[in-house]
Structure formats: structure tokens, C-alpha cells
């Protein structure tokens, strides 16, 4: 377990589940102070491995709405607009932290959860398995 | 502010900042029960827009370690291994939730924070600006 550092300014916890249960301020601090010009929302259309965005909503989760990527093609789009099936469009996935209401419907009690989300797609050279 | 819903099983909060301050169980539940065979860790090498992974560590953050993608090239890699500068390698970014210790060094008090991370790279057709 974690020992409490000698910092008298820390909130105390008498909870028997301490340190698994902690206090979290939901007033989100956004570190992305300036809008990132490179964070384009049209990459999903301009990519050689384009994707569609699918809406996943779960009111018991925080964030409740997550937009997930699904690759449009098995192959990758060539300069002429045709699909090259010698290459593969694959989802780039990331494990992210979310909060799950626990017990359900409670506005002020959550549990951390890890979920795997597809963020976008990339074009890769396929792994070719040679038969002996 | 939010009134506690009529669910007597919900923990109460007398905190004056309620509902911004909530209880969170850090005992992470992992929804990804089976290992996804498609979640390959070698896409960063096989992609036409390959990337390197950089370790970002911050002991005051949970999770402390985040791996960030940085595209290797401005252009995209062609079948012959050369870089095509008529196309662009761009980072696919996602806003994720992390917990930041607040006050600093406190083990049981956090604030939610949104940070923008680069998860991987994709190859896109550049936007061409025509000069009149």
C-alpha cells in the first residue's frame, strides 16, 4: 500500500478501503491550453486508411460519450482513389481510463475502469506467412 | 448543483464543493477481458506513416507513465522503402483523462485532467492551398 507522505495539507481518509478509494475533483483541468492546429478533425477522411466515427454512449460512464474509429476498408486507398488490398487498414487502439458509476445511478461515486478504444486507422504492410 | 438521486445505496457527500468532488475506487476494473489479437504492438514499424514511442513520466499523475507517438517522417513510406513527400505523416491525437495529485504529493486526493496524447500516425493527402 501507499504510505501517506508527511504533508499535513493532504485530506485525510478514514475509509476502511483507503487508499483504494480517493477523492477526485471532477472540475476538469484542461492542459491543452491552446488549440492545437495539428489536431485536425478531417484526418479520418484524408487518410489512406480512412475511418468512420461511431458514437458509443453509456450514461453510467464518465466520459459518457466516446467516438470510436472503424476503418472503412480492409485495404488502403491509393492516389487514384482505388483500394490497394496488398496493404491493410488497421485500427490504432489505446487503453484509456474512464470512471464508472458505482453503485449505478450514483452521481458522486465512481470506480476507475480501463477500456480499449480505437482512435483512428493507419495503413500497414501485411505480415505474409510463407507456407513451407 | 446536483441533488443525490433517490438511490439510498449512494454514498453521501457533505463536501461544500459537491458534486465536483466525488469518491473514486482506484481498484481498476479492466473491461478488456481477452487479449485482442489485432492489437499488435508492431504497427508503429509496419505503418506507411511509422512512429517512435516516447516515454512521458510524471509521478504526480495517474497513470504516471504515458507512451506518446512521434511520426518518424514528414512524408509517408512507399512500397520501395523511400519516403513520399507528396503525402504527410500526421499524429492521431486523443484527449484522455488522467488523475493529477492535488495538493501535490497527496496519495488520496486528485483532480481530473484532460491531456492530449498522440497515439499513432496515419498517412494523409495534404491540403493544397492554391495561390490566386
Amino acid at each position: 500500500g501507499i504510505a501517506i507522505p508527511r504533508n499535513s495539507g493532504c485530506p485525510n481518509s478514514e475509509d476502511k478501503n483507503f487508499p483504494r478509494t480517493v477523492m477526485v475533483n471532477l472540475n476538469i483541468h484542461n492542459r491543452n491550453t491552446s488549440t492545437n492546429p495539428k489536431r485536425s478533425s478531417d484526418y479520418y477522411n484524408r487518410s489512406t486508411s480512412p475511418w468512420n466515427l461511431h458514437r458509443n454512449e453509456d450514461p453510467e460512464r464518465y466520459p459518457s460519450v466516446i467516438w470510436e474509429a472503424k476503418c472503412r476498408h480492409l485495404g488502403c486507398v491509393k492516389a487514384d482513389g482505388n483500394v490497394d488490398y496488398h496493404m491493410n487498414s488497421v485500427p490504432i487502439q489505446q487503453e484509456i481510463l474512464v470512471l464508472r458509476r458505482e453503485p449505478r445511478h450514483c452521481p458522486n461515486s465512481f470506480r476507475l475502469e480501463k477500456i480499449l478504444v480505437s482512435v483512428g486507422c493507419t495503413c500497414v504492410t501485411p505480415i505474409v506467412h510463407h507456407v513451407a | 448543483g446536483i441533488a443525490i438521486p433517490r438511490n439510498s445505496g449512494c454514498p453521501n457527500s457533505e463536501d461544500k464543493n459537491f458534486p465536483r468532488t466525488v469518491m473514486v475506487n482506484l481498484n481498476i476494473h479492466n473491461r478488456n477481458t481477452s487479449t485482442n489479437p489485432k492489437r499488435s504492438s508492431d504497427y508503429y514499424n509496419r505503418s506507411t506513416s511509422p512512429w517512435n514511442l516516447h516515454r512521458n513520466e510524471d509521478p504526480e499523475r495517474y497513470p504516471s507513465v504515458i507512451w506518446e507517438a512521434k511520426c518518424r517522417h514528414l512524408g509517408c513510406v512507399k512500397a520501395d522503402g523511400n519516403v513520399d513527400y507528396h503525402m504527410n505523416s500526421v499524429p492521431i491525437q486523443q484527449e484522455i483523462l488522467v488523475l493529477r495529485r492535488e495538493p501535490r504529493h497527496c496519495p488520496n486526493s486528485f483532480r481530473l485532467e484532460k491531456i492530449l496524447v498522440s497515439v499513432g500516425c496515419t498517412c494523409v493527402t495534404p491540403i493544397v492551398h492554391h495561390v490566386a
Epitope: 476538469i28 484542461n30 478533425s41 478531417d42 479520418y44 466515427l53 461511431h54 458514437r55 454512449e57 453509456d58 450514461p59 453510467e60 464518465y62 466520459p63 459518457s64 460519450v65 467516438w67 445511478h105 452521481p107 | 446536483i2 441533488a3 438521486p5 433517490r6 484527449e95
Partner: antibody, heavy 121, light 107 residues
Framework: EVQLVQSGAEVKKPGSSVKVSCKAS????????IHWVRQAPGQGLEWIGV????????FYNQKFDGRATLTADKSTSTAYMELSSLRSEDTAVYYC??????????????WGQGTTVTVSS | DIQMTQSPSSLSASVGDRVTITCSAS??????IDWFQQKPGKAPKRLIY???ELASGVPSRFSGSGSGTDFTLTISSLQPEDFATYYC?????????FGQGTKLEIK
């Protein structure tokens, strides 16, 4: 103060298109989705679809899929709803409303004032 | 699609009356519902969110309850400004759907 200000009334011919705007202010545009709802004269509320300004994602009520196009311009914090192949049944008041994607608990909290679209030959 | 059926579709009541409007989902179990009030020529105004929660600035005579498929909006003591049309709205199940509305009129 949170505000959603919509464009003015439109009169359109059958078969044409209309584009309604919804300018948001007083909050971080990227943190909320914009949902569109319409109300025909004397009728109830009907959900058209949703646009996420942050990702560019859109999701439509199947009834409007193919005819409705939802977009957003992050630089001006403005959302748009375009409806094509207009028919008389599309005569309605069109509303935009923001939706907290971080916490559905809060639902559709602020609404635009509505834009009246009349389709008539 | 999940259909939300409101009852009654209209009702007449007097100032001071206690009024109950119900909303039933056609199938499945709804996570949360919202209740909106709408006056002629105006945009809907949210009264209740997440089934039970009173929206900011809404008088405490309004309350919400229910779970699963059956939900209720109660006005404990009708005031003159409460005469309007009320809509329930389910969220979390595609597509979002609204009840057909309940018109509350002065008796």
C-alpha cells in the same frame, strides 16, 4: 453565460436545401456535442441527429440519414444542419441543443431559440 | 426504436392541484430520462434531468421519479405559469426519442 443563437427563418421551395446555423458561446465548444431536434406545427419533438465538433463525428436518426448533414466549424464555434430534398413535411421549427458528452447525466441543458423553416411552392 | 408513451395526452387542472404525468418506454430498460416544459413559440426548457434531478432555477414543486420503463413527473401544487406542454425524453438508447407530449390546460 451559455448561449446558442440560431440563424433566422427560411422559406424554401420543395426539392431545395436549407442550412441552419447555431452559434455557441459561453462554454468550451469541444466539450459538448450539438444535437438537432425539430418540431412540426402542432406536433411533438423529433430528434434529427448529433455532431461532435471535437472529432467531426456525426450520428443520424435513420429517418434523416442521407438528407441531413451535420457539421461544425470549431474556429467560429458554430454548428450547422443542412437538410436537402426538402418537402412540405419538413416545415418545422429546428432547434440545436448542446449535450454534455462527459456526463450524460446533464443531458440537453441549453437550447437555441429555434429556426422556422417553411417549405412551400 | 424505443417509443416513449406519455399519458395523459392532455389534462385540465386548477391552480393548487397536484398533477402527475407518466411516461412509459416500449421496450428495454432506460438509463435516465429528462422532462421538458414548452410554452407556445418557445424552445423547450429542461425541468428534470437524470430522472430525479431538478434543473437549475426550476421550482421544487417539480419532481421526477421512476426506473426501468416507467417514469413520472409530478407537480405538487400547480401555479399559473405551469400551464404548458410537457415532454419526456430518453437518452442512451439510439435514437433519442421524445414522448408525444402532455398538454396541461387550466380547468
Amino acid at each position: 453565460e451559455v448561449q446558442l443563437v440560431q440563424s433566422g427563418a427560411e422559406v424554401k421551395k420543395p426539392g431545395s436545401s436549407v442550412k441552419v446555423s447555431c452559434k455557441a458561446s459561453g462554454y468550451t465548444f469541444d466539450d459538448y456535442e450539438i444535437h438537432w431536434v425539430r418540431q412540426a406545427p402542432g406536433q411533438g419533438l423529433e430528434w434529427i441527429g448529433v455532431n461532435d465538433p471535437e472529432s467531426g463525428g456525426t450520428f443520424y436518426n435513420q429517418k434523416f440519414d442521407g438528407r441531413a448533414t451535420l457539421t461544425a466549424d470549431k474556429s467560429t464555434s458554430t454548428a450547422y444542419m443542412e437538410l436537402s430534398s426538402l418537402r412540405s413535411e419538413d416545415t418545422a421549427v429546428y432547434y440545436c441543443t448542446r449535450y454534455d458528452k462527459w456526463d450524460s447525466f446533464y443531458g440537453m441543458d441549453y437550447w437555441g431559440q429555434g429556426t422556422t423553416v417553411t417549405v412551400s411552392s | 426504436d424505443i417509443q416513449m408513451t406519455q399519458s395523459p395526452s392532455s389534462l385540465s387542472a386548477s391552480v393548487g392541484d397536484r398533477v402527475t404525468i407518466t411516461c412509459s418506454a416500449s421496450s428495454g430498460s432506460i438509463s435516465y430520462i429528462d422532462w421538458f416544459q414548452q410554452k407556445p413559440g418557445k424552445a423547450p426548457k429542461r425541468l428534470i434531468y437524470a430522472t430525479f434531478e431538478l434543473a437549475s432555477g426550476v421550482p421544487s414543486r417539480f419532481s421526477g421519479s421512476g426506473s426501468g420503463t416507467d417514469f413520472t413527473l409530478t407537480i405538487s401544487s400547480l401555479q399559473p405559469e405551469d400551464f404548458a406542454t410537457y415532454y419526456c425524453h430518453q437518452l442512451g438508447s439510439y435514437p433519442d426519442t421524445f414522448g408525444q407530449g402532455t398538454k396541461l390546460e387550466i380547468k
